[in-house]
Amino acid sequence: TQNKALPENVKYGIVLDAGSSHTSLYIYKWPAEKENDTGVVHQVEECRVKGPGISKFVQKVNEIGIYLTDCMERAREVIPRSQHQETPVYLGATAGMRLLRMESEELADRVLDVVERSLSNYPFDFQGARIITGQEEGAYGWITINYLLGKFSQKTRWFSIVPYETNNQETFGALDLGGASTQVTFVPQNQTIESPDNALQFRLYGKDYNVYTHSFLCYGKDQALWQKLAKDIQVASNEILRDPCFHPGYKKVVNVSDLYKTPCTKRFEMTLPFQQFEIQGIGNYQQCHQSILELFNTSYCPYSQCAFNGIFLPPLQGDFGAFSAFYFVMKFLNLTSEKVSQEKVTEMMKKFCAQPWEEIKTSYAGVKEKYLSEYCFSGTYILSLLLQGYHFTADSWEHIHFIGKIQGSDAGWTLGYMLNLTNMIPAEQPLSTPLSHSTYV
């Protein structure tokens, strides 16, 4: 008789990434008998929740349930019913909620309470909703990309099965850009991590890793833009802000109350003689770059070297995966290719920012104007952050790999978070076993 496959023995996990600008739900799947193997967990679904981040629901918490419904119901469809009760669900909130908590711990708790109540209504094994720290966000992003790239596997291969694989066990650094924060995480070369807050020690699959990480709150792309506007309006002579980070001909009215709503602009807050001002784009990359640099305080460093704002940063080492908004923005600008030098990226940004707004709108007719209008700023901000903030150079630029997915799984902190919480990354290398014989009878 012919061998026939047994029903697959798989497990699932769900992680919700409650970011500052939106929430995404990820569903992961893995073979049950290979939980401790490296690289076996993969993403089977991403569901982007329609609407803004959960922190925006602070005055309408009773709507959080309906906001999450479509994606939670999607999870119910994707995961077989027999697996529902044993499928863990985790929600991690990032910098948007960190900012809300800074303003009011009570309001942040209220949002999380309603989130927990909503998620508890589903047939899954809900494990809690919490605000993860910036350090965790950096660490889990680093774990995710190295897990997916096979860097924790002790088996060396003569062939490459994943992109960017260099067949050595040197880990990749992780560069994550969100709306409200940005993280840099990597293993420095024989370098003491001079500030304990930035040091992580892991033992993964029998190997020790001393990892540097830092999360810069308020330096995600959206909050960086609010900071820049708040800084620039201080010196505007009237309610017109001629802004080099927006295309020539672009106009937009901004409410001062919106500008000062975030804790990120507190340091620039002042009494203005108007309630609204108008941004008028002038589209000049160089001037935009200069304006962004003023957000980075590089005049003070209590360590051997710093990134900015007095934060220790060891010398950069090895290759880096740049994901989340680093990838989305550069992908839109068509600048993710490994062949594009930093000089070429700068050149392309100069041209892009100088293009008239009417021309841009025609060229990208399908893109929402709010997003479209901010790519000049975001692209320029990414260059400024990587070059002046983190000290990448024209030479080391080629070590940055803009990554959206690896092996079909999104690069980001969620996979690493689930691997950790489900104890799927052992400290010690599992004993190698012969090929499983349980698949066929």
Partner: nanobody, 124 residues
């Protein structure tokens, strides 16, 4: 613009049922969420039940198991079937159609349309 017209309210005894209807007209392709809010005298307006464009639903704890929201896309109408009514369900019931903004600035809702309301009174 979207116009919403409620019907089906009235006076009913405890334990009985009512079915509210909300007919939508106008530019409704921009709407993902529809729902029913209610407001009793001296109270804030509260969300009772909501339904998404995909037909998924959500209910306030106080009405779970008693009320059912449904949507007939062909007729552009949303219904609220209210069973086992209680005196505390007495309120003006408003139909609401909305969609959320994706942006971190400005209001939470990009579109927000309301009906005039229909009175539901549950007598003991």
């Amino acid at each position: 613009q979207v116009q919403l017209q409620e019907s089906g309210g009235g006076l009913v005894q405890t334990g009985r049922s009512l079915r509210l209807s909300c007919a939508a007209s106008g530019d409704i392709f921009s709407i993902n969420y529809m729902g029913w809010y209610r407001q009793a005298p001296g109270n804030e307006r509260e969300l009772v039940a909501a339904i998404t464009g995909r037909g998924n639903t959500n209910y306030a704890d106080s009405v779970k198991g008693r009320f059912t929201i449904s949507r007939d896309n062909a007729k552009n109408t949303v219904y609220l079937q209210m069973n086992s009514l209680k005196p505390e369900d007495t309120a003006v019931y408003y139909c609401n159609a909305w969609d959320y903004s994706d942006y971190d600035e400005g209001p939470l809702r990009e579109y927000d349309y309301w009906g005039q309301g229909t009175q539901v009174t549950v007598s003991s």
